[in-house]
Amino acid sequence: EEELQVIQPDKSVLVAAGETATLRCTATSLIPVGPIQWFRGAGPGRELIYNQKEGHFPRVTTVSDLTKRNNMDFSIRIGNITPADAGTYYCVKFRKGSPDDVEFKSGAGTELSVRAKPS
């Protein structure tokens, strides 16, 4: 079977301040099992934006129903965008591991740019 790929089709997204950003991400397989997480930035200092498994992310909603057993769409919406939200967002697939899940595949990233509200 084909190895799972994480696809972020948009290299960049431009959103006006105060609006909602949609960051698209799909996986090509359900296997290996494990959660999807979204990060802003790369490397050790990256910021967790959304974790499928757990946590409270009040500004983030998922585009699809992640409780569907065959769901492979992990796109998210981030509400009330501000200039501080600008950056590159990565959709990352983890495979289950013990005691911690193991990073398996990352999307290529989507750069979010924020257009200031006209004064």
């Epitope: 359900l30 296997i31 099992v33 499928q52 409780t67 057993r69 065959n70």
Partner: antibody, heavy 117, light 108 residues
Framework: DVQLVESGGGVVRPGESLRLSCEAS????????MSWVRQAPGKGLEWVAG???????YYGDSVKGRLTISRDNSKNILYLQMNSLTAEDTAVYYC???????????WGLGTLVTVSS | SYELTQPPSVSVSPGQTARITCSGG??????YAWYQQKPGQAPVTVIH???KRPSDIPERFSGSSSGTTVTLTISGVQAEDEADYYC???????????FGGGTKLTVL
């Protein structure tokens, strides 16, 4: 506190129908997938059916076509419609909340369905 | 689909360590859980996602996995731990939940 309370069980004759309900409280019902699991007298657990928050449905092989899972997110109720019942359907039926990866974290106390002539 | 196999019974003295194994499924496509059931009661989840313990479950319960075998370990077994224990799995390939046949834990 998460609470799941099943109702609707009882004694029916073979070929008859029954609808089970599971009233949920203490969590955001509309955000969680749910399942029904049954246990025949003196036997082990058997997964019956599952439903996503958006009402996509999934069934165990032994019940496909006869049992229908559904939900009403406005009332926080999970249902199991059981048709063409046979003696093999005699069991305690539990409703269970699913975790993000479709295992179960909370269970109701169960409701007994007896199919007997 | 797949079958989960566990021993019908395990016996242990109080204070000792009990280990219940469950085999079957595929590591990369299956998540496992352990459910405790006492006579006349509903199941209680003691481990989910292979090795995650709910906050209200005592620390003496732990889960581990190696290849296609998962293990429930109860350290310092107490009399109240006597129950049936079911291994459960979710297979991401088939979208199916499966249970093992159950293991009766007897505390001598």
């Amino acid at each position: 506190d998460v609470q799941l309370v099943e109702s609707g069980g009882g004694v029916v004759r073979p070929g008859e129908s029954l609808r089970l309900s599971c009233e949920a409280s203490g969590f955001t019902f509309s955000s969680n997938a749910m399942s029904w699991v049954r246990q025949a007298p003196g036997k082990g657990l058997e997964w019956v059916a599952g439903i996503s928050s958006g009402s996509d449905t999934y069934y165990g092989d032994s019940v496909k076509g006869r049992l229908t899972i559904s939900r009403d997110n406005s009332k926080n109720i999970l249902y199991l419609q059981m048709n063409s019942l046979t003696a093999e359907d005699t069991a305690v039926y539990y409703c269970a909340r699913e975790t993000w990866n479709h295992l179960f974290d909370y269970w109701g106390l169960g409701t007994l369905v007896t199919v007997s002539s | 689909s797949y079958e989960l196999t566990q021993p019908p019974s395990v016996s242990v003295s109080p204070g000792q360590t009990a280990r219940i194994t469950c085999s079957g499924g595929d590591y990369y496509s299956t998540y496992y859980a352990w459910y405790q059931q006492k006579p006349g009661q509903a199941p209680v989840t003691v481990i989910h996602s292979d090795d995650k313990r709910p906050s209200d479950i005592p620390e003496r319960f732990s889960g581990s996995s190696s290849g296609t075998t998962v293990t429930l370990t109860i350290s310092g077994v107490q009399a109240e731990d006597e129950a049936d224990y079911y291994c459960g799995g979710y297979d991401g390939r088939t979208y199916i939940n499966t249970f093992g046949g159950g293991t009766k834990l007897t505390v001598l």
